[in-house]
Amino acid sequence: QAAPFPELCSYTWEAVDTKNNVLYKINICGSVDIVQCGPSSAVCMHDLKTRTYHSVGDSVLRSATRSLLEFNTTVSCDQQGTNHRVQSSIAFLCGKTLGTPEFVTATECVHYFEWRTTAACKKDIFKANKEVPCYVFDEELRKHDLNPLIKLSGAYLVDDSDPDTSLFINVCRDIDTLRDPGSQLRACPPGTAACLVRGHQAFDVGQPRDGLKLVRKDRLVLSYVREEAGKLDFCDGHSPAVTITFVCPSERREGTIPKLTAKSNCRYEIEWITEYACHRDYLESKTCSLSGEQQDVSIDLTPLAQSGGSSYISDGKEYLFYLNVCGETEIQFCNKKQAAVCQVKKSDTSQVKAAGRYHNQTLRYSDGDLTLIYFGGDECSSGFQRMSVINFECNKTAGNDGKGTPVFTGEVDCTYFFTWDTEYACVKEKEDLLCGATDGKKRYDLSALVRHAEPEQNWEAVDGSQTETEKKHFFINICHRVLQEGKARGCPEDAAVCAVDKNGSKNLGKFISSPMKEKGNIQLSYSDGDDCGHGKKIKTNITLVCKPGDLESAPVLRTSGEGGCFYEFEWHTAAACVLSKTEGENCTVFDSQAGFSFDLSPLTKKNGAYKVETKKYDFYINVCGPVSVSPCQPDSGACQVAKSDEKTWNLGLSNAKLSYYDGMIQLNYRGGTPYNNERHTPRATLITFLCDRDAGVGFPEYQEEDNSTYNFRWYTSYACPEEP
């Protein structure tokens, strides 16, 4: 029997039942490699509470249709007194990426999964040349899912401060250059997920091979390698490779575009700080609303409830389905059943079944999918209780006053599936928006202006046009709602600009769209503020103008008009200046745009060195000076000593040339002991200094060796700009 979804065959996939602490391993074409589940298990269930394994689907007992895979077993189970076999059922829906199998629910006998994937699409329009799984579960079974970052056309430009080359990447799949309007990518070879553009030429420097990996819980890693045998002439005989490390942002709130952190011998190290790398909670509720502070999610489906005897009707060929959400169906022939979903046979309307009851309801928000499940309906002939799964999709232009209507999509073993497009399923997630702008290779980052939490304070705009008695206070935050503190305490919760006067407070606009580069300045538009009459809402424009060295000046109110519907502010700030790379001497570096000066000379040890230990090695490093430790070479800035035999390697000659770019200060030591390879590549050290105001001098942390460079990270207060 041919594999039904060949694109999904190369991997063993994972799904999780978080409520019951169960991890499922799924291999839809072969068997999972888990001894405890037997040699032919396609779906293996690992119960972490009881530390037991059970096969809940056998690869030999597979049956498939276009949208459903069933794996039976020979294991008996008891449901409602009838004898059945344990089985797994995977319902497939068309998606735009390979996607992830999602656990839906489990009864005594059936384990239900749903999988939105390109493999289930009738047409190949979303299918990639090369794509790998793009999610992982951590030890606590929390999901980290990068699928939302996958670009279906075009690519991400990696921020690398090199004007002569541009590195473009996609996440977990190759770059689709055909559908991308940008001419730069047209020359990229097919299959590449990392494309280096030099002048008019484009080179494949990496293709996806393995899925996303979790390293040390807080970091996800994706590796691309060049498959072709031919070497690239600018790589000094090395094979190109790309490693992208995705980092869940810390409280420091760094930017959210991929940054090149190391580049030597065509080994590209990219760090990408993004909220998609954080774990995504599964939010569940037994009511019709749910909210999750961590994701900034708030959902309420109660406006969809029908009353006064009316229901939603969905046509299912032989049957009509009468549905209500957040309440029982009040159709006459259903109402004794306390049904939320009521199934009526068209040819015989006396045949009425409850396909899920209002009291047995679960609303789940998981990885961007909003699902309402109704359990506990009338039994089928097999003994299973009918159940309905409604997948909600956001549609801001849905009919029926935005409510939309449910559409029956199919039935699988007495489980009825519906999709429902409605504006009430729209969830604005904070990850969607960047706090910066790009203009070709030029990059702008406004994150220095963001105020996150107390003791920070909102920016207050200057308004010289008013007398003290009629004074309005204008509180502004950038890319973030205003903090409800001080005079802004009464401001509407989601306002990014707020006006406060003696009559109260007003929302002058929300952060809904990312900043834009316009006419040499950065424009930030806040919209959807309070009503201002004639069905209009208040809108605010902020024009940010580059002023090197100034992160202290406040925004200024320029105009307000259209009957209080429009406000315009101007803000002269260093945050609106283009990011540029600067190099310094004598252990200092000056960022001329922002006006920051950094001096790391207090970290230099006049005698000795900083010692960092790992299991096998001791590392000795100094900052802007040589290590003076036996047995290290006297002019080395860093050296490595094997614990077993004291063998020593010079990891680079010391120097005091710091470089600064976008909040990162780096010190590079080159020309160390050559490797014993063809090219005799000299070892090098890269120390990245990051701001931590509490750390004092701080300490170096060894991160990893990537081919020829030893990477250290160092949080220190000396890497912090003077606070404005």
Partner: nanobody, 114 residues
Framework: EVQLVESGGGLVQAGGSLRLSCAAS????????MAWYRQAPGKEREVVAA???????YHEGSVQGRFIISRDNAKNTVYLQMNSLKAEDTAVYYC????????WGQGTQVTVSS
């Protein structure tokens, strides 16, 4: 709520030993670099030792060979074994977690009498 609770401090004679513990709760412990800092009266707070989430270890020069930092991810605890204590080691010792967020403990007093 994140909490770091230090224990094990006290009064000890020069040349003696103490073992400090710092129990963490409310955070994904294994993702954090854990460090011990100390602050002697009238002096700035300084780092003593640190252990990263990838188990790279740092000891400040003045304590090398005498102090040993270690961690037990299963117990969400970081330790500082202090041997051959000197009068200049007298200080309040603070535990610090640095990762997706930064947190400090309240401190534990170590007094070394000569």
């Amino acid at each position: 709520e994140v909490q770091l609770v230090e224990s094990g401090g006290g009064l000890v004679q020069a040349g003696g030993s103490l073992r400090l513990s710092c129990a963490a709760s409310g955070l994904t412990f294994s993702s954090y670099t854990m460090a011990w800092y100390r602050q002697a009266p009238g002096k700035e707070r300084e780092v003593v030792a640190a252990i990263s989430s990838g188990d790279s270890i740092y000891h400040e020069g003045s304590v090398q060979g005498r102090f040993i930092i270690s961690r037990d991810n299963a117990k969400n605890t970081v330790y500082l074994q202090m041997n051959s204590l000197k009068a200049e080691d007298t200080a309040v010792y603070y535990c610090r977690a640095n990762g997706p967020g930064t947190y400090w403990g309240q401190g534990t007093q170590v007094t070394v009498s000569s």
